[in-house]
Interface confidence: medium
């Protein structure tokens, strides 16, 4: 049996659980999956936590990887620090443990990177491109307390079956998080159902004390109760419902008050009617009907964009006028042609360099010795349906022999889609892409939102935009931290990311080579660090009250939400962006997230130098999204990955190591 055919499994302690999901996902998809269950990607910060992860992962198959919650934004290297500039998805950089598989590399680290854990061996940490769908992911769930596993009783028909709040069912838990249900079957044919609940005296415990398989109060058939049967002192039974449900009129069954609630967006049990309706951030309750939600127009907020702003349902977007380009903050504009454009100019001849002649290598690229060794992984392949992401790894698959038209790729993600509820938005219908010139905006129809020039003053505290995912209807508000993210329009089915290789135009990117280290790397670096963050560290978390960068560029934004349409170049003037590509970023057509491949969300990087541009730095639409890991959008990638053996790490006193030898790496897709 292939061990990876296993079901998800978990290991719980008194205050948290780790769960392994052997499901192939990108970093963003994994992050979302953990969040939807109320957790986060695993953040093993101490040797003790790492040990728990090790015992859960066990000796998995060789060559398998699991995402953990570590991510680094572009140009955020801090190689001297234990986490090397990586940030936990919880938003901080505290750690007392690292387990890097590779020595830290020098270089400017121009692209976003994420960390995966080897499922075999010493479970080392490998850094690489976030868009690869690796073999699984580790989630972590924190809670207020846990109940110990029930002791087996003489009258039990079998072990207790536990169901956790994150939907894992097993008999193997040692601790059960608050909110778990234990089902005990007795030999007499009846059973008991217990809930791990808060106790009146404090702490948590099982809703009922043993013995469970004696007496007749709730027998047979759980006293007829749908959820929980309680034996009262006088011998009669009463039924109770688990949290979020209420007892129905029959006194036995339980109903979800939100199941029939007429809330347009979000519903929460409780309140006088049994439920209360809420709107996602970016929306507010309609004045005439509190069940409905109407869009908030952020473009009315002074200084939200430096130059021009367009509001759309659930979000807004900044654009710059011709001759300017949108900076990484998605708000500011700077004169076009600043640093960064040349970086990709001369790559073509090097991309497929077989590494025989190191003298020919561009020194700027030689520095990338750190990341996953480029295995050929997914060679780009022709899409048969929209791909999960515009990139995915491994060496790109070549395709048709004609050169492909490179399209600019937004580097900011789309709003998160509803995990289970189909997303229906009042989207604009467009029959062709809209190209907007800075002087004469061309609007596709009368329904197009107005283009509003933005004023320049900095945002005051009360004008800061809480940006939480417009498309995340079913997450409880507790799971939606207020973090800036940006939407990323869908790519049309025939979309090709920009080509860098002039040598091999027939090779088009699709899957990026996994940047995983050669498994022959010697010298695992397992390092224990003192926890704590240097005082000048600013975590990459923009909270609801955080200042948005005040400088805003002269940009204009046009964003249409529509069903997926082909990009058709037109003769109309295109907006200037940092990508050197024939198609304007105004050709972005966003698709309801439920129908489009997930794109990659982005935090506004507070530490990123504003004058730095990556080789492709397209528009940064702002979407209201929870704090989600930033995924720099599809970058141009190599058509082929020609990796070479990873350097052997020679651990130093700090647990980091210099390169034992200079290994030529191909991180040039970044």
């Amino acid at each position: 049996q292939d061990p990876w055919a296993a079901e998800p499994r978990a290991a719980c302690g008194p205050s948290s659980c780790y769960a392994l999901f052997p499901r192939r996902r990108t970093f963003l998809e994994a992050w979302r999956a953990c969040r939807e269950l109320g957790g986060d990607l695993a953040t093993p910060r101490t040797p003790e936590e790492a040990q728990r992860v090790d015992s859960l992962v066990g000796a998995g198959p060789a060559s398998r990887l699991l995402w953990i919650g570590l991510q680094r934004q572009a140009r955020q290297c801090q190689l001297q620090r234990p986490l090397r500039g990586f940030t936990w998805t919880t938003g901080d950089q505290d750690t007392a443990f690292t387990n890097w598989a590779q020595p830290a590399s020098g270089g400017p680290c121009p692209a976003q990177r994420c960390v995966a854990l080897e499922a075999s061996g010493e479970h080392r940490w490998l850094e690489g491109s976030c868009t690869l769908a690796v073999d699984g992911y580790l989630c972590q769930f924190g809670f207020e307390g846990a109940c110990p596993a029930l002791q087996d009783e003489a009258g039990q028909a079998g072990p207790a079956v536990y169901t956790t709040p994150f939907h894992l069912v097993s008999t193997e838990f040692e601790w059960l998080p608050f909110g778990s249900v234990a089902a005990v079957q007795c030999q007499a044919g009846r059973g008991a159902s217990l809930l791990c609940v808060k106790q009146p005296e404090g702490g948590v415990g099982w809703s009922r004390a043993g013995p469970l398989c004696l007496g007749t109060g709730c027998s047979p058939d759980n006293g007829g109760c749908e959820h929980e049967c309680v034996e009262e002192v006088d011998g009669h039974v009463s039924c109770r419902c688990t949290e979020g449900f209420r007892l129905a009129a029959d006194g036995r069954s339980c109903e979800d008050p939100c199941a029939q609630a007429p809330c347009e967006q979000q519903c929460e049990p409780g309140g006088p009617q049994g439920y209360s309706c809420h709107c996602r951030l970016g929306f507010r309750p309609a004045e005439d009907d509190p069940h409905r939600c109407v869009d908030t127009d952020e473009c009315q907020i002074a200084g939200v964009c430096q130059q021009m702003c367009v509001n759309y349902v659930g979000g807004f977007e900044c654009y710059c006028s011709e001759g300017h380009e949108l900076e990484a903050d998605g708000i500011s504009c700077s004169p076009a042609g600043a640093m960064g454009a040349q970086a990709s100019q001369d790559l073509g001849d090097e991309l497929l360099d077989d590494g025989e002649d190191e003298e020919d290598e561009d020194e700027a690229w030689k520095a990338f010795n750190g990341g996953w060794t480029e295995m050929p992984g997914i060679l780009w392949m022709e899409p048969t349906q929209p791909p999960d992401f515009a990139l995915a790894y491994r060496p790109s698959f070549p395709e048709d022999r004609e050169p492909q038209i490179p399209y600019p790729e937004p580097t900011w993600p789309p709003p998160l889609s509803a995990p289970r509820v189909p997303y229906h938005s009042s989207v604009l219908s467009v029959t062709r892409p809209v190209v907007v010139s800075a002087t004469h905006p061309t609007l596709p129809s009368a329904h197009q939102p107005p283009v509003i020039p933005a004023t320049h003053p900095a945002l005051s505290r009360d004008h800061q935009i809480p940006v939480i995912a417009a498309n995340y209807p079913d997450l409880p508000s507790a799971y939606q931290p207020g973090i800036l993210s940006v939407s990323h329009s869908a790519q049309p089915p025939a979309h090709q990311p920009p080509m860098i290789s002039t040598k091999y135009p027939e090779l088009f990117p699709a899957h990026q080579s996994p940047m995983f280290p050669d498994t022959r790397v010697a010298g695992t670096q397992t390092t224990t660090h003192l926890p704590g963050i240097p005082p000048n560290h600013a975590p990459l978390v923009t909270t609801l009250g955080a200042q948005l960068p005040p400088q805003a560029p002269d940009a204009l934004v046009l964003r249409t939400q529509a069903t997926q349409l082909p990009i058709i170049p037109t003769a109309q003037p295109s907006l200037t962006t940092t990508s050197r590509s024939p198609v304007s970023p105004a050709h972005q057509i966003s698709v309801p997230a439920a129908t489009q491949p997930a794109a990659l969300p982005t935090l506004l990087p507070s530490q990123s130098p504003t004058n730095q541009t990556s080789p492709i730095s397209p528009t940064h639409p702002h979407s209201k999204a929870p704090q989600i890991p930033r995924e720099d959008g599809p970058s141009p990638k190599l058509a082929l990955w020609l990796p070479s053996p990873a350097p052997t790490a020679a651990p130093t006193a700090l647990g980091e190591a210099g390169l034992a030898e200079h290994s030529q790496r191909d991180d040039r897709w970044l």
């Epitope: 055919a5 499901r23 192939r24 997914i378 780009w380 790894y393 050669d518 022959r520 990796p643």
Partner: antibody, heavy 120, light 107 residues
Amino acid sequence: EVQLVESGGGLVQPGRSMILSCAASGFTFSNFDMAWVRQAPKMGLEWVATITYDGSRTNYRDSVKGRFTISRDSAKNTLYLQMDSLTSEDTATYYCARHGSSYYWFFDFWGPGTMVTVSS
Amino acid sequence: ETVMTQSPTSMPTSIGERVTLNCKASQSVGINVDWYQQTPGQSPKLLIYTASNRHTGVPDRFAGSGSGRDFTLTISNVEAEDLVVYYCLQYGSLPFTFGAGTKLELK
């Protein structure tokens, strides 16, 4: 136990079409990229096509591009190879193979193969 | 395409001997080379992936090495069941290409 079983082979006339199937079991089919590899009688191995785990991307060797289509149905745990405009050069045993990793392209499990003979 | 040249085409050996099979790529493929074993009438079996990593269940008498263009498969103590055909595969560039094979046979 990981199992791949090909079917659909046989004798076909040049210019005609044929579809091969590969039934997968013993692993989470939707987690793995899959491929077809062929071997002409008394000859070596030749990679034909690969499809990603989610079916979103495919690739083919030049000699079959435009004639062969690789596809998958994760609900049925089945991989397909639609072969059109067959020629005698396509005569071979066709193996269904699993790419064993999310980031390496090695083939860790192979089916027993199904023989396709293109002859008039 | 990247051509994989295997040598020798046929390798006479004796039981218990140590043999080395070679595979040379026409261009650098990093460590993206595998070795497969094929018994007549059966499908190929993965022995070594990414140049040097033994697949699950493969006896440790099989070892792979190399990177760039030159790769070797070493069988340290040949057994009777090893007298079959061995193929190398590269996936550092498209199309994926196999070598023509080396047949291990008794002297």
